[in-house]
């Protein structure tokens, strides 16, 4: 039975040109995390963090995605096109797959909102394949 829950940074906002940290945390389970996949709204994989093999940042994002902190991901040099949903997919054993969702809104530099700032409401979601 899957008992775990994913906590995420929920709905966040950051300024154009700035950076933001995408963070998920799996709790309430003893399952072993074997891999975390970071995905974008359009089916693009941003990065994979394999528990043993380390990070693989996808070629299209290498110049502006940094691994970490922890199992999280840092997006840099934000553009308006980065606005949208991001997903962390936790592959675990023996539970299976958990998935969390983050919504990022990129704001014009002149507007309000701080990098990695706005609206840290935690979002809980678990999903199994």
């Amino acid at each position: 039975m899957m008992t775990g829950t994913i906590e995420t940074t929920g709905n966040i906002s950051a300024k154009k040109g700035g950076s933001v940290i995408l963070q998920c945390h799996l709790s309430s389970t003893m399952a072993q995390v074997t891999q975390v996949n970071w995905e974008q709204h359009d089916h693009s994989l941003l990065a994979i963090r394999n528990a043993e093999l380390g990070w693989h940042i996808y070629p299209a994002f290498k110049d502006r995605v940094a691994p970490g902190p922890g199992l999280g991901l840092t997006l840099q040099s934000l553009t308006m096109n980065d606005t949208g949903e991001y997903f962390c997919t936790y592959h675990t054993y023996p539970d299976g797959t958990y998935r969390g969702r983050i919504f990022l809104e990129v704001l014009e530099s002149s507007g309000g909102g701080g990098a990695g700032g706005g609206g840290h409401h935690h979002h809980h979601h678990h999903h199994h394949h």
Epitope: Q35, N37, H43, I48, N50, H56, Y58, P59, H129
Partner: antibody, heavy 121, light 107 residues
């Protein structure tokens, strides 16, 4: 230039243990990457068996996990595969390969030439 | 386990023509797919990683596309050395799996 070369007996009896070695030239296996075994039954597709990471940790295909051991001999710069309790279904060409996970994800960029192992009495 | 299904099993193409090979995943693998070429008696050779990126030294006539569950390897103008078996592989999950292969033969 990185090169990998498999070696070991070409014939193994049923119920015995298959043992293969992969010698790595041009790179120290303790310096990085993960080192894999893949097999290919005659006329069929490829099946990933497992790997040993340069740190020494291992990971195996769940379908073979109970029979597989992959280990490293750092003094000889080689890694080995042991597959126990073999049957005719284990007859295959066995390949060793390197995975540069940071650059290419789960794709394997260097392969040995392969060695055919036949399980027969 | 994620199952990768390749089609067709055999593709007959004339030299100079275009070849289009298909690979379907049993579940969404985003863009975590690689393609390999294998000639008789040889080891597989990495062509494409991350669904669409050519590996070092691979000619531009090889291109990969797709995301989610459907992927394509295209060889724009087949050369004599391209007749071989091609395999796709997924690495979205922690258990890597390969397709059954497509044999590209001379028509």
């Amino acid at each position: 230039q990185v090169q990998l070369q498999e070696s070991g007996p070409g014939l193994v009896k049923p119920s015995e243990t298959l043992s293969l070695t992969c010698a790595v030239y041009g790179y120290s296996i303790t310096s990085g990457y993960s080192w894999h075994w893949i097999r290919q039954p005659p006329g069929k597709g490829l099946e990933w068996i497992g790997y040993v990471h340069y740190s020494g940790s291992t990971n195996y295909n769940p379908s073979l996990k109970s029979r597989v051991t992959i280990s490293v001999d750092t003094s000889k710069n080689q890694f080995s595969l042991k597959l126990s309790s073999v049957t005719a279904a284990d007859t295959a060409v066995y390949y060793c390969a390197r995975m540069d996970y940071g650059n290419y994800g789960g794709a394997m960029d260097y392969w040995g030439q392969g060695t055919l192992v036949t399980v027969s009495s | 386990e994620i199952v990768m299904t390749q089609s067709p099993a055999t593709l007959s193409v004339s030299p100079g023509e275009r070849a289009t090979l298909s690979c379907k995943a049993s579940q969404d693998v985003r863009t975590a797919v690689a393609w390999y070429q294998q000639k008789p008696g040889q080891a597989p050779r990495l062509l494409i990683y991350s669904a669409s990126y050519r590996y070092t030294g691979i000619p531009a006539r090889f291109s990969g596309s797709g995301s989610g569950t459907e992927f394509t390897l295209t060889i724009s103008s087949l050369q004599s050395e391209d007749f071989a078996v091609y395999y796709c592989q997924q690495y979205y999950s922690t258990q890597w799996t390969f397709g059954g292969g497509t044999k590209v033969e001379i028509k």
